[in-house]
């Protein structure tokens, strides 16, 4: 049987360069801080490979004690760097990653920095801010999304084969027009997920199917034409 | 790079047949449909038919259906339509087309007058 | 047969324009498509692939979305070189069908 499998595929894409971040302009920082919510929990998820800037409460950095981040990840010890603005020090217990930075130095910006987000940055991360009148708290639950590398092939006749390898979180994979279809999840040890989807057409007027994945990174269609039915040699539509 | 070279123009008689050929270079041209397309002067774009080089099998449109015939060569790479008893109605310029549409010949014209 | 209404027919134009043009799919079937310009004595040529993707080489003025039976051509601030006749082509079922085609005429 010839080769029609054209395999198509998308090149990860390079996002090096950017970066996001939730971090409130200056201007917008609360000088009446005591209004601000003692506690606010955020899910942020954020493109693998991108820089990350996570940010404290916003709160004026003179009525400062202690700043506190503390960082939780996937089977990892409690990681937790501290400034201390009495004596200007800062402290580090149980972090390893070197990519988890402060954005400068602490007693000019309380910010912290993820350079080239991972897998293994997924997790939990709370900053907490000790003033006169009291602590404040941010939390941020971090969830690294993985763009799915996606295929189209054929691998019998009128069947054909879409997968989306290693997204993060599962892609939804459909297709026009709809044929009678399996879907199989594969998880990774690294919390990807691979989605294949092997469909079947009978009806014999389809002539290419396209394969539409969709994920939190962005959508990708590939499209295919069908082979011929065995045997089939003349038909008029 | 995808290449579908076109046969050259033709004037015909009414009555008489045609055999217009596509000669492929780029890809592996058993393994693509070869589609053809109709555009009369002044007119829209319309579907002939399409052939699987690998194994021969062809879909025509009913209104192409008894009157062309598409055939390949895989020997040569070359896809060839004929269109038999001719009339002026017939007169267009005809495409090929492969990979899923997105490679077009230059077309060839057929004139058909008495 | 699936058939594709193209609109409009035609289109006066200016240079600077934001032009859009639709294709939809009859029986509420969903379609893919590829859309197509065509001067005048040339082969149609390739812009826009499966509803959406600039082909390579395409200014970027030129743009597809839409999806299942409702498709739209736009091009966003129109060249003198853009003065041509387009199309789109379902190729999802056989008979694989185009629009009518949009012509386009400076005003």
């Known amino acids: 049987q010839p080769n029609n499998s054209l395999m198509l595929q998308t090149s990860k894409e390079n996002h090096a360069l950017a970066s996001s971040s939730l971090c409130m302009d200056e201007k917008q920082i609360t000088q009446n801080y005591s209004k601000v919510l003692a506690e606010v929990n955020t899910s942020w998820p954020v493109k693998m490979a991108t820089n990350a800037v996570l940010c404290c409460p916003p709160i004026a950095l003179r009525n400062l004690i202690i700043i506190t981040w503390e960082i939780i990840l996937r089977g990892q010890p409690s990681c937790t760097k501290a400034y201390k603005k009495e004596t200007n020090e800062t402290k580090e217990t149980n972090c390893t990653d070197e990519r988890i930075t402060w954005v400068s130095r602490p007693d000019q910006n309380s910010d912290l920095q993820i350079r080239t987000v991972a897998i293994t940055h997924d997790g939990y991360y709370r900053c907490i801010m000790v003033t006169p009148d009291g602590n404040f708290h941010r939390g941020y639950h971090l969830q690294v999304l993985v763009t799915p590398e996606v295929t189209l092939f054929q691998n019998r006749n009128r069947t054909a084969v879409c997968k989306a390898v290693a997204g993060k979180p599962a892609a939804h994979i459909s297709w026009i027009p709809e044929g009678d279809c399996a879907t199989k999840q594969e998880y990774w040890s690294n919390g990807t997920v691979t989605v294949k989807s092997t469909c079947h057409w009978e009806v014999h007027n389809v002539s290419t199917v396209t394969c539409h994945v969709s994920h939190l990174t962005g959508n990708k269609s590939l499209y295919i034409e069908l082979l011929p039915v065995p045997g089939a040699k003349k038909s008029a539509k | 790079q995808v290449q579908l070279v076109q046969s050259g123009a033709e004037v015909k008689k009414p009555g008489a047949s045609v055999k217009l050929s596509c000669k492929a270079s780029?890809?592996?041209?058993?393994?693509?449909?070869m589609h053809w397309v109709k555009q009369a002067p002044g007119q829209g774009l319309e579907w002939i038919g399409n052939?699987?080089?690998?194994?021969?099998?062809?879909n025509y449109d009913e209104k192409f259906q008894g009157r062309a015939t598409l055939t390949v060569d895989t020997s040569t790479r070359t896809a060839y339509m004929e269109l038999s008893s001719l009339r002026s109605e017939d007169t267009a310029v005809y495409y090929c087309?492969?990979?899923?549409?997105?490679?077009w010949g230059r077309g060839t014209l057929v004139t058909v007058s008495s | 047969d699936i058939q594709m209404t193209q609109s409009p027919s035609s289109l006066s134009v200016s240079v600077g324009d934001r032009v859009t043009i639709t294709c939809q799919a009859s029986q509420g079937t969903p379609i893919n498509l590829h859309w197509f310009q065509q001067k005048p004595g040339k082969a149609p040529k390739l812009l826009i692939s499966g509803a959406s993707n600039l082909e390579d080489g395409v200014p970027s003025r030129f743009s597809g979305s839409g999806s299942g039976t409702d498709f739209t051509f736009t091009i966003s601030s129109l060249q003198p070189e853009d003065i041509a006749t387009y199309y789109c082509?379902?190729?999802?079922?056989?008979?694989?069908?185009f629009g009518q085609g949009t012509k386009l005429e400076i005003k």
């Open positions: 087309l492969t990979m899923t549409g997105t490679s």
């Open positions: 052939i699987y080089p690998g194994s021969g099998s062809i």
């Open positions: 082509l379902q190729f999802t079922y056989i008979p694989w069908t």
């Open positions: 780029g890809h592996t041209f058993t393994s693509y449909w």
